[in-house]
Each structure stands twice: as C-alpha cells, then as structure tokens.
C-alpha cells in the first residue's frame, strides 16, 4: 500500500504519500484553533504509471492509454485513499471544546 | 455537478470532465473485443481552486493551503467521481459473449 509506512521510508518517485505540515494560522489563516497549532496533513504526489496502485478499471484503461499515447494530457492522478480525523481544541468563550475534524490527514494514496 | 451535461456544453477551465475516445486496438492494444471498436471513456482535467467541487475536508484544506502558498506542489487533483460500465461483445470461438466491463466511462469529476 502507498501508505506512510512505505512512502516515508522510501525514495519512491511514483505516486506516494508525502510529508506536509500545515500551520493553522500561517497556512490556512485559521486563528481560532487553540490546539494543535498545526498538524501533519501530508499530501499525495508522483506519477501514476501503468499498474501503479490503480484505483478502478477506468484508471487502468487511462494508464494503458497513456502507455500507448505518451504525452497525452489524459492520465491518472495521485490522490488520497485513506484519510484520518484530527482532534482539535478550540474555545467557545472561556469554555474549551474538543472536536474531531473528519478526513484531515492523508494516510495513503492511490492513482485515480 | 462537473458532469458531461455541464462540462461538454461549457468552456470551463477548472476541473471538468473532458471528451476522450479510446480505440481498443490502437490505444490499448486489445484486438479481441468485437464490439464496440472503441468508446467515449472521457477524462478529468483542470485546476482545483478553493471551493471548486472539493471532495473532502482534506481537499478543502489543501486548496486553502494552496491559496496561502501559491506554487506549492501540494494541491487537489481533478479525478473521476461517477463512473459507468461499458457493455462489450467478444467471441469465445464462434460463440459471441456479452459482458459488462465495470467503471469504464467517466460521467463526472471532482477535486480530490
């Protein structure tokens, strides 16, 4: 699987999950989150050659089409597969509130 | 929705479904399919700016990150959303066989 275990410990050039730290204030302009100040969101990047973790029949077709038509603009793209939530703390007045923001962290990628 | 109805009738520059015809022999190297000779597979293409048909919380975060960090390599990607099957006819000896190939046609796209 193109997950953090594999991708972070390899020099994989094809589609894989990459490290990305997002600072809530600086990168998103969100000042209201108290904790954490930022988080490891990660992102998906890399080419999707034929057979590389292809998601559907269609992505297999497109990768095969690409093999026969190099330089075509139609190609599968490396996108998130498994996403995880992020717990945050923010204040409502003086009262801290804990909430889960769903689908915030990329754990693995696929070619779609 | 970024579907064929909208995208084929507009000059949309952002993520949208685009027309692509695939010839089984020429583009995939498949000689064994009797009918059809090819089909309109379509493909997804175009940038994914903030708020443009974003798929998950994560893709919203990434688009926002991109807005704050122009030129960053982390960005949402335009990929298939709705896929449809394709019926094909091939011969097993002299006997025709009809089969559905699942997820072969792109009907709409999303930013993921």
């Amino acid at each position: 699987a193109l997950d953090t275990n594999y991708c972070f410990s390899s020099t994989e050039k094809n589609c894989c999950v990459r490290q990305l730290y997002i600072d809530f204030r600086k990168d998103l302009g969100w000042k209201w989150i108290h904790e954490p100040k930022g988080y490891h969101a990660n992102f998906c990047l890399g080419p999707c050659p034929y057979i590389w973790s292809l998601d559907t029949q269609y992505s297999k077709v497109l990768a095969l089409y690409n093999q026969h038509n190099p330089g075509a603009s139609a190609a599968p793209c490396c996108v998130p597969q498994a996403l995880e939530p992020l717990p945050i703390v923010y204040y409502v007045g003086r009262k801290p509130k804990v909430e889960q923001l769903s689908n915030m962290i990329v754990r693995s990628c696929k070619c779609s | 929705a970024l579907d064929t109805n909208y995208c084929f009738s507009s000059t949309e520059k952002n993520c949208c479904v685009r027309q692509l015809y695939i010839d089984f022999r020429k583009d995939l190297g498949w000689k064994w399919i009797h009918e059809p000779k090819g089909y309109h597979a379509n493909f997804c293409l175009g940038p994914c700016p903030y708020i443009w048909s974003l798929d998950t919380q994560y893709s919203k975060v990434l688009a926002l990150y991109n807005q704050h960090n122009p030129g960053a390599s982390a960005a949402p990607c335009c990929v298939p959303q709705a896929l449809e099957p394709l019926p094909i006819v091939y011969y097993v000896g002299r006997k025709p066989k009809v089969e559905q190939l699942s997820n072969m046609i792109v009907r709409s796209c999303k930013c993921s």
Partner: antibody, heavy 121, light 111 residues
Amino acid sequence: QVQLVQSGAEVKKPGASVKVSCKASGYTFTSYWMNWVRQAPGQGLEWMGQIFPFSGSTNYNEMFEGRVTMTTDTSTSTAYMELRSLRSDDTAVYYCARGIGNYALDAMDYWGQGTLVTVSS
Amino acid sequence: DIQMTQSPSSLSASVGDRVTITCRASESVDFWGNSFMHWYQQKPGKAPKLLIYLASNLESGVPSRFSGSGSGTDFTLTISSLQPEDFATYYCQQNAEDPLTFGGGTKVEIK
C-alpha cells in the same frame, strides 16, 4: 523478453485444493488472456480455462466448472489457478500460457515452465 | 466439443527426411475467412512451443522448414528437411469452438 515463471511442485492428498501461481514479466500483463493447460503423465494437453487480467473475465472448460477458479493480481502481474476436490487423475503438469491476443480463445505463444501437481494418499 | 485426431500417433524418420503430420477436426474450424488451427512442438520435460498459427502462419523465430496447410477439417504440418532438434512430439490445437482442444500428439522419433 516475455517470461512466465510458475510456482514449484506440489504434493496433495485427495480432496484437497492446490493453487498454482504464474508470474508474468516482459509484457503488459493486463492486455492478454492467460490460459491454463494441463498434461497428465505421458498424455496429451488439456485446456482448463482462461482469464483476462484487466477485468477478471473468465472462460472455463465445462469439464472443470465448479472445481477451478482462475484469478490474477495485477499489482504483481501474477495469475493463479486453484483446483479443488483433487483426485488422483488430477496428477499432471499444469502450465500457464499467454494467448497471442487476437481473440479470447487463441493460439498460445508463451508458456510457463510447468508445475507438477501430484495427488496421492 | 471438437475432437482432434492426429495421425500417425508416432513415426520414425531420419535427419533430412520430409515429414508430414495430419490433423483432422470433427467439424470445420473455419470462420471469418480463417482456419482456427495451430501447431505446437513439445520436447520431453519442456513446455509446448508455438510453431504455426491460423493453419499456415509461421510463428516468429521458427525455422522456415516448418510449414502448415489445410482448411475446414483437414490440416497438415510439414517439416521439409528434418533436423536433429526436431525430434519431439507435435500437437495441433483448435480454437473455433469452446472448449479449446488439442490433438493427441504425434511423436517423431529417430529411425
């Protein structure tokens, strides 16, 4: 160059199942039908069935229907043939063989080295 | 199922001989203007090797001394001048009907 490398010899008891693998290299695995053919000791060739790796479409010889399952793993370009409820007359060399690509049923241009399956109590 | 009958089942020949093997199908294997008949060579302990496809087409890399002919139900494999490496068993195969079937084989031995 095209190569089909099969798993090693197996000894099985009657009633058991066997799963033979065939790893393909040197060509686009998902674009050609993969056939399975067997040959009992000193006998001729018998076609068991085939699979198209792209879609998983299969055509089985009726003689094996219900006892055989052909599958593929496209991520490793490997084809598998599982035969269940083994009998002593299933003792044979099992070959995977690539169809030449013009039709589903076709001539076969590349063959694996064969896997001997012995069924004995 | 289409039955494939090869003859002879075995033959003895010498290097340089012209050898002819025949294959008869229980029904015509012709359609779409092609004869769906193929020939293979198999040596002991080895996998079969494709020699001729669609009755008369020589597979790439196969010596030109091998040739195939025929249509309908009757087909022939000819080796124009037998070489030492040609001693093997030869099989015909049809793919006009499901299931694909093979002939019983013809063993070519050294005289």
